[in-house]
């Protein structure tokens, strides 16, 4: 089953996604795909790295964590309804058959009808949001807190601080991250 | 125009060993997972193997990946199969086929050789 | 392993009949289907990927459905140079594989 995230009409979808490089600047190929992940590849490829930079990447869809230290969580900017469905993070680790695959469930919603206009509730890195931890039976998931509300002003900011946050921590710490080497 | 032709089969005693090629043309090689696949005598078809862009990554059958080793020359724009200690079940007609592209999207062998026929018998 | 089961595994029909070849995997495979069309002593020609999009040449008469398990191949209107084997095969799961086939025979 796939790991559920949620955001708004309009707002910047994140979907996490980590890997531990086996030494520094040692990356791995990444993609991500529209659709879940199928035997090879990230079906329909939206972003890609190498093993020194993003080679490929499609309007809307940037890594904005550092992706030479292994993050290479996914944000997609001004979501709409039809961004709703499944993406598939896979890290292309060389050898026979050893790629990791990540299916993540975006939920789109439409935007909230409120009456403060300067007042935005669920910008993408909202939360509750889902985690998977590793294992191959139905995924495990663990939900963590809401972030309070957020002024319209902060969101442009958010998305910067966030791989540095106690939020990435977590995200690591709850085994979403691959260790190579 | 997209050729893929397979070369190097033939008969050969079981226990024995085989190295099949692929020469491919009319496409940029290296931007496209290669496969083999084989078709037993009067039976169906069987995945073998899968290779990625520069051969860094391979995917196998689990029960011949101890037996064979799928490789590519992205310089010679070639695809290989070596085969080891032979069986007479592996007699087949084998087929190298062009795989997914580098952006995804479209699953399923778009273009495939003529085959080669390796028997195994003594 | 994900199972790829197709029925009938054999068919007469006419030419000029819709013939309709259903294949059923064991697990979601999501739309990773494909289907092929192989005659007596020739490779396996590509006819659907993706579960429904057809490949580059293959006659509008061939036309592929579904998604999660259930998948089908019709052929609306049967021509001569129809009448061939035919495999569907998934892309989702490791190892890749294929139905057992669907000899499709002239009545």
């Known amino acids: 089953s796939e790991v559920e995230y949620r955001a708004e009409v309009g707002q910047n979808a994140y979907l996490p996604c980590f890997y531990t490089p086996a030494a520094p600047g040692n990356l791995v190929p990444v993609c991500w795909g529209k659709g879940a992940c199928p035997v090879f590849e990230c079906g329909n490829v939206v972003l890609r790295t190498d093993e020194r930079d993003v080679n490929y990447w499609t309007s809307r869809y940037w890594l904005n964590g550092d992706f030479r230290k292994g993050d290479v969580s996914l944000t997609i900017e001004n979501v709409t309804l039809a961004d709703s469905g499944i993406y598939c993070c896979r890290i292309q680790i060389p050898g026979i058959m050893n790629d990791e695959k990540f299916n993540l469930k975006l939920v789109i919603k439409p935007a909230k009808v409120t009456p403060a206009p300067t007042r935005q509730r669920d910008f993408t890195a909202a939360f509750p949001r889902m985690l998977t931890t590793r294992g191959h039976g139905p995924a495990e998931t663990q939900t963590l807190g809401s972030l309070p509300d957020i002024n319209l002003t902060q969101i442009s900011t958010l998305a910067n601080e966030l791989r540095d946050s106690r939020l990435a921590n977590d995200l690591r710490d709850s085994g979403a991250t691959i260790r190579i080497g | 125009e997209v050729q893929l032709v397979e070369s190097g089969g033939g008969l050969v005693q079981p226990g024995g060993s085989l190295r099949l090629s692929c020469a491919a043309s009319g496409f940029t090689f290296s931007d496209y997972y290669m496969a083999w696949v084989r078709q037993a005598p009067g039976k169906g078809l069987e995945w073998v193997a899968n290779i990625n862009y520069d051969g860094s990554s391979t995917y196998y059958l689990d029960s011949l990946k101890s037996r064979f080793t799928i490789s590519r020359d992205n310089a010679k724009n070639s695809l290989y199969l070596q085969m080891n200690s032979l069986r007479a079940e592996d007699t087949a007609v084998y087929y190298c086929?062009?795989?997914?592209?580098?952006?995804?999207?479209?699953?399923?062998?778009?273009?495939w050789g003529q085959g080669t026929l390796v028997t195994v018998s003594s | 392993d994900i199972q790829m089961t197709q029925s009938p595994s054999s068919l007469s029909a006419s030419v000029g009949d819709r013939v309709t070849i259903t294949c059923r995997a064991s697990?979601?495979?999501?739309?990773?289907l494909a289907w092929y069309q192989q005659k007596p002593g020739k490779a396996p020609k590509l006819l659907v990927y993706?579960?429904?999009t057809l490949a580059e040449g293959v006659p509008s008469r061939f036309s592929g459905s579904g998604s999660g398990t259930d998948f089908t191949l019709t052929i609306s209107s049967l021509q001569p140079e129809d009448f061939a084997t035919y495999y569907c095969q998934q892309h989702y799961g490791s190892p890749l594989t294929f139905g057992q086939g669907t000899k499709l025979e002239i009545k």
């Open positions: 993706n579960a429904k």
């Open positions: 697990d979601n495979i999501y739309s990773y």
């Open positions: 086929a062009r795989d997914v592209g580098y952006y995804g999207g479209n699953y399923g062998f778009a273009y």
